[in-house]
């Protein structure tokens, strides 16, 4: 199970895949209908980044996309890979780094207003590798346009924070990305150790509200690194 990877204050280290060598990049195997989980069930918390299993592009960080680490690899074995820079080859928009999109197999720059459609109007259904397309990339489901006219309420599925009503942000909540409340003073928050790690969590918290920052709680300064509690505090 994914229990021990759910600590949202940790970077994750995958075990080798089933039958794989210890030095091989970690990968995911399909363990149950619609759910991806690692080849073994032991995760360790480490400071250096390791590959993260995924079923959808949206489960990866903003500078990553979800694909098989080997060409022509099994569709069930997918991890988050670094996005492709401008002029690099691509197969779909999500492969290109932010500010670019895939045109005629090449990542090209997108001007701000021109390209809002395909990526933003779709959302994935988490763990959905039971609906993979022929090219091995998970099927996307288009959200009803109704959702884009009405701002999402707490708990409703979303693609980005602008889909959510005021005071809410769009964050992963195990099974999907949903609108959650922006954190208030004193609430537990997540301090990210590396840029982009927010996209790697299966449970995400929103950011701290205006005038607040995520800092170590004073009475937790003596605690060990792994158990330090961060809360939203006044600047």
């Amino acid at each position: 199970t994914l229990n021990s990877v759910l600590n949202s204050n940790a970077i994750k280290n995958l075990p080798p895949p089933l039958g794989g060598a210890a030095g091989h990049p970690g990968s995911a195997v399909s363990a149950a209908p619609g759910i991806l989980y690692p080849g073994g069930n032991k995760y360790q918390t480490i400071d250096n980044y390791q590959p993260y299993p995924c079923a959808e592009d949206e489960e990866c960080g903003t500078d990553e996309y979800c694909a098989s680490p080997t060409r022509g690899g099994d569709a069930g074995v997918q991890i988050c890979l670094a996005c492709r820079k401008r002029r690099k080859r691509c197969m779909r928009h999500a492969m290109c780094c932010p500010g670019n999109y895939c045109k005629n197999g090449i990542c090209v720059s997108s001007d701000q207003n021109h390209f809002r459609g395909e990526i933003e109007e779709t959302i994935t259904e988490s763990f959905g590798n039971d609906h993979s397309t022929l090219d091995g990339y998970s099927r996307r489901t288009t959200l009803s346009s109704k959702m884009y006219h009405t701002k999402g309420q707490e708990g409703s599925v979303c693609l980005r924070s602008s889909d959510c009503a005021s005071g809410l942000c769009c964050a992963r909540h195990f099974w999907s990305k949903i609108c959650k409340p922006v954190l208030k003073e004193g609430q537990v928050c997540t301090k990210h150790r590396r840029k982009g790690s927010h996209g790697l969590e299966i449970f995400q918290r929103c950011y701290c509200g205006e005038g607040l920052s995520c800092r170590i709680q004073k009475d937790h300064h003596q605690a060990s690194n792994s158990s330090r509690l961060h809360t939203c505090q006044r600047h």
Epitope: L2, S4, K180
Partner: antibody, heavy 116, light 110 residues
Framework: QVQLVESGGGLVQPGGSLRLSCAAS????????MSWVRQAPGKGLEWVSG????????HYADSVKGRFTISRDNSKNTLYLQMNSLRAEDTAVYYC?????????WGQGTLVTVSS | DIALTQPASVSGSPGQSITISCTGT?????????VSWYQQHPGKAPKLMIH???NRPSGVSNRFSGSKSGNTASLTISGLQAEDEADYYC??????????FGGGTKLTVL
């Protein structure tokens, strides 16, 4: 306000079938995952099944896998649970619940009794 | 399988504070910060009281608070009132069984 109303419970013999329904109102049904949770008489809560907002992803507890099927009709704002090959141990109050931030709204439940 | 252990019963007098514990293995409650609490009055549906360990949904009294230390999550009810008498369930999440509940704790207000 959010409202969930279950129906379809009743007395059924072991091996029999039953279909539960849950009518949802007061929120955009098609924007939420939904679940069924059950509670045997005098016992604790047990998650049974969950379904994604469009219905293309479904998940089940091991105890009901292969016997129960969860589905939804977003045009009718209704969640369903088709229960086949029922056993005595399936006797419980069945709740439908919205998967917002966790199980944030629940119906009042419908009693399913499996007995000969 | 994940198991969350709760005391079968706790009791307290009106105005007092009580704490209900929920202990899990290191791979569930202790392995991450996510625990929720539900209240269930006899013959009624459960109600979400706490999510993400310590956050109250709107409409829930601030007399209810949650915390976590190591492998144990706790629900504290301060200024105990007669209407708090109910069953309380902790819940965590598992990738295969989604929602996992503790066995429940019966709170009696003396």
């Amino acid at each position: 306000q959010v409202q969930l109303v279950e129906s379809g419970g009743g007395l059924v013999q072991p091996g029999g079938s039953l279909r539960l329904s849950c009518a949802a109102s007061g929120f955009t049904f098609s924007s939420y995952w939904m679940s069924w949770v059950r509670q045997a008489p005098g016992k604790g809560l047990e998650w049974v099944s969950g379904i994604s907002y469009s219905g293309s992803n479904t998940h089940y507890a091991d105890s009901v896998k292969g016997r129960f099927t969860i589905s939804r009709d977003n045009s009718k704002n209704t969640l369903y649970l088709q229960m086949n090959s029922l056993r005595a141990e399936d006797t419980a109050v069945y709740y439908c619940a919205r998967m917002g931030i966790d199980l944030d709204y629940w119906g009042q439940g419908t009693l399913v009794t499996v007995s000969s | 399988d994940i198991a969350l252990t709760q005391p079968a019963s706790v009791s307290g007098s009106p105005g007092q504070s009580i704490t209900i514990s929920c202990t899990g293995t290191s791979s569930d409650v202790g392995g991450f910060n996510y625990v929720s609490w539900y209240q269930q009055h006899p013959g009624k549906a459960p109600k979400l009281m706490i999510h993400d360990g310590s956050n109250r949904p709107s409409g829930v009294s601030n007399r209810f608070s949650g915390s976590k230390s190591g492998n144990t999550a706790s629900l504290t009810i301060s200024g105990l009132q007669a209407e708090d008498e109910a069953d309380y369930y902790c819940q965590t999440w598992d990738s295969l069984s989604f929602f996992v509940f503790g066995g429940g704790t019966k709170l009696t207000v003396l």
